[in-house]
């Protein structure tokens, strides 16, 4: 008996061939001997089976002695033995229909679990192997689970179902809902405008939810909510914003926040959370702000940074075009009695400058100028 595997929702074509290459009488029946379809001369007629409105044939092939049974929009319960009666012969085909579905939704938050469930006909014993977009293989029986989904798991999962040495392939598109970056850091000189951007790593037709930015300033003992907002069909509307700082928010995606001035009291780290409609859990992105200030007070030239800097960052003070006068893995450096000229304060990581502030030191009888 020939075995054919089908996919739920798909169309399958079961073949039946006569030795005579001409149109002759044929009938397709199910295992209960109920007629599905057949012909009367060149006319296709149907029987009272449950497949009635989903069964078809190809009349153009009859003259070649081929009498296929086409079943559209396959259901698991279509799994059966189908019998083609032609030329006093009976050809039997066993059809096994499988379905593979993702738990509840194919749009999942980063860190959530993905469960793939195989629907199979009674009496079958299939095995399943799935390959993720990043090449990870998972195997199982009726269910397969992947915990802690990552951004790289977004894309097409290819799953192969094996039964009776035959295989059928399913493709399931999974979207991992996350921000493009888990964390970002912004370096600014005191007084500069600060732009925070929170691009999403996915696109959907309609995006609705609500979000909030909590901020932990380095100088503050506790965190506070800087802004809350709503998202409706990709349109952003601010619900509440603190008076200090007075943040501004873009009306369109990607989520975009503007801090009018970088000040030492704002330096610190924030956590933007986004709760999406009909999803349990939230999306998170950490954002850090490092602020630099260079000052000269009497005979002391000082450079300071505030905010979350890593211990390997180097803070330096140097006169333009000269070697660094002072370089330390600290958050403040100074030079006593600096020479006149343009001084540079540099925050760097392995030689790469992250932040630079210039200050002009005038001869001692003048006051310093900060460009």
């Amino acid at each position: 008996k020939k075995v054919v595997l089908g996919k739920k929702g798909d169309t399958v074509e079961l073949t039946c061939t006569a030795s005579q290459k001409k149109s002759i009488q044929f009938h397709w029946k199910n295992s209960n001997q109920i007629k599905i379809l057949g012909n009367q001369g060149s006319f296709l007629t149907k029987g009272p089976s449950k497949l009635n409105d989903r069964a078809d044939s190809r009349r153009s092939l009859w003259d070649q002695g081929n009498f296929p049974l086409i079943i559209k929009n396959l259901k698991i319960e279509d799994s059966d033995t189908y019998i083609c009666e032609v030329e006093d012969q009976k050809e039997e085909v066993q059809l096994l229909v499988f379905g593979l579905t993702a738990n509840s939704d194919t749009h999942l938050l980063q860190g959530q679990s993905l469960t793939l469930t195989l629907e199979s006909p009674p009496g079958s014993s299939p095995s399943v192997q799935c390959r993720s977009p990043r090449g990870k293989n998972i195997q199982g029986g009726k269910t397969l689970s992947v915990s802690q989904l990552e951004l790289q798991d977004s894309g097409t999962w290819t799953c192969t179902v094996l039964q009776n040495q035959k295989k059928v392939e399913f493709k399931i598109d999974i979207v991992v809902l996350a921000f493009q970056k888990a964390s970002s850091i912004v370096y600014k000189k005191e007084g500069e405008q600060v732009e925070f951007s929170f691009p999403l790593a996915f696109t959907v037709e309609k995006l609705t939810g609500s979000g909030e930015l909590w901020w932990q300033a380095e100088r503050a003992s506790s965190s506070k909510s800087w802004i809350t907002f709503d998202l409706k069909n990709k349109e952003v509307s601010v619900k509440r914003v603190t008076q200090d700082p007075k943040l501004q928010m873009g009306k369109k995606l990607p989520l975009h926040l503007t801090l009018p001035q970088a000040l030492p009291q704002y330096a610190g780290s924030g956590n933007l959370t986004l709760a999406l409609e009909a999803k349990t859990g939230k999306l998170h992105q950490e954002v850090n702000l490092v602020v630099m200030r260079a000052t000269q007070l009497q005979k002391n030239l000082t450079c300071e940074v505030w905010g979350p800097t890593s211990p390997k960052l180097m803070l330096s003070l140097k006169l333009e075009n000269k070697e660094a006068k002072v370089s330390k893995r600290e958050k403040a450096v100074w030079v006593l009695n600096p020479e006149a000229g343009m001084w540079q304060c540099l925050l760097s990581d392995s030689g790469q400058v992250l932040l630079e502030s210039n200050i002009k030191v005038l001869p001692t009888w003048s006051t310093p100028v900060q460009p």
Epitope: F43, K46, G47, P48, N52, D56, S57, R58
Partner: antibody, heavy 123, light 107 residues
Framework: QVQLVQSGAEVKKPGASVKVSCKAS????????LHWVRQAPGQGLEWMGI????????SIAQKFQGRVTMTRDTSTSTVYMELSSLRSEDTAVYYC????????????????WGKGTTVTVSS | DIQMTQSPSSLSASVGDRVTITCRAS??????LAWYQQKPGKAPKLLIY???TLQTGVPSRFSGSGSGTDFTLTISSLQPEDFATYYC?????????FGPGTKVDIK
């Protein structure tokens, strides 16, 4: 547009035969099946049979088998229905009607009808 | 052969009324069912095929539903030109068979 023009009314004696024609126009003749349906005075519709103009094969309702012959002439795009051994109960309006032919299933609903031919059987 | 029954056999209604006619097949025909309208002295006119698909040019007040053995033709708001006899027909297997008809006349 698709049109079916039927032959004129006929008066026949019992035992005689009648041949009704149905000329098709406005489409490719072999692209549509043709049915014959009759309606006795004050009665409902009764399907008599179908012809496939492309090959000429027919399927006739059992009630009419042996008495009905359906033929076609592709050169004139005309289908004929001949009913023999006429009896008084064959008095009716005879309609031809089309079903578009597709490679795949479309069901046998009849979308275009002729105006009908009245056949009266009376001694 | 598949027997087709229709109910009611006749009904009286007024312009603007909602009219429902039912058709039952003696065995399953999937969605292979057609509805026709016939006026005295005229050929039948196809209204609906495949149980629920409106034939081109037929007003949207006509609708069809059902599958398997039970089918319905609905006229949402009866118009003067809708007074006629309505037939259902199974379009699934030979011999093709029609229902006995439902005559809709003016109340």
């Amino acid at each position: 547009q698709v049109q079916l023009v039927q032959s004129g009314a006929e008066v026949k004696k019992p035992g005689a035969s009648v041949k009704v024609s149905c000329k098709a126009s406005g489409y490719t003749f072999t692209d549509y099946y043709l049915h014959w349906v009759r309606q006795a005075p004050g009665q409902g519709l009764e399907w008599m049979g179908i012809i496939d103009p492309s090959g000429g094969s027919t399927s006739i309702a059992q009630k009419f088998q042996g008495r009905v012959t359906m033929t076609r002439d592709t050169s004139t795009s005309t289908v004929y229905m001949e009913l023999s051994s006429l009896r008084s109960e064959d008095t009716a309006v005879y309609y031809c009607a089309t079903t578009a032919y597709y490679d795949f299933w479309s069901g046998y609903s009849m979308d275009v009808w002729g105006k009908g031919t009245t056949v009266t059987v009376s001694s | 052969d598949i027997q087709m029954t229709q109910s009611p056999s006749s009904l009286s209604a007024s312009v603007g009324d909602r009219v429902t006619i039912t058709c039952r097949a003696s065995q399953g025909v999937g969605n292979d069912l057609a509805w026709y309208q016939q006026k005295p002295g005229k050929a039948p006119k196809l209204l609906i095929y495949a149980a629920s698909t409106l034939q081109t040019g037929v007003p949207s007040r006509f609708s069809g539903s059902g599958s398997g053995t039970d089918f319905t033709l609905t006229i949402s708001s009866l118009q003067p030109e809708d007074f006629a006899t309505y037939y259902c027909q199974q379009a699934s297997s030979f011999p093709l068979t029609f229902g006995p008809g439902t005559k809709v006349d003016i109340k």
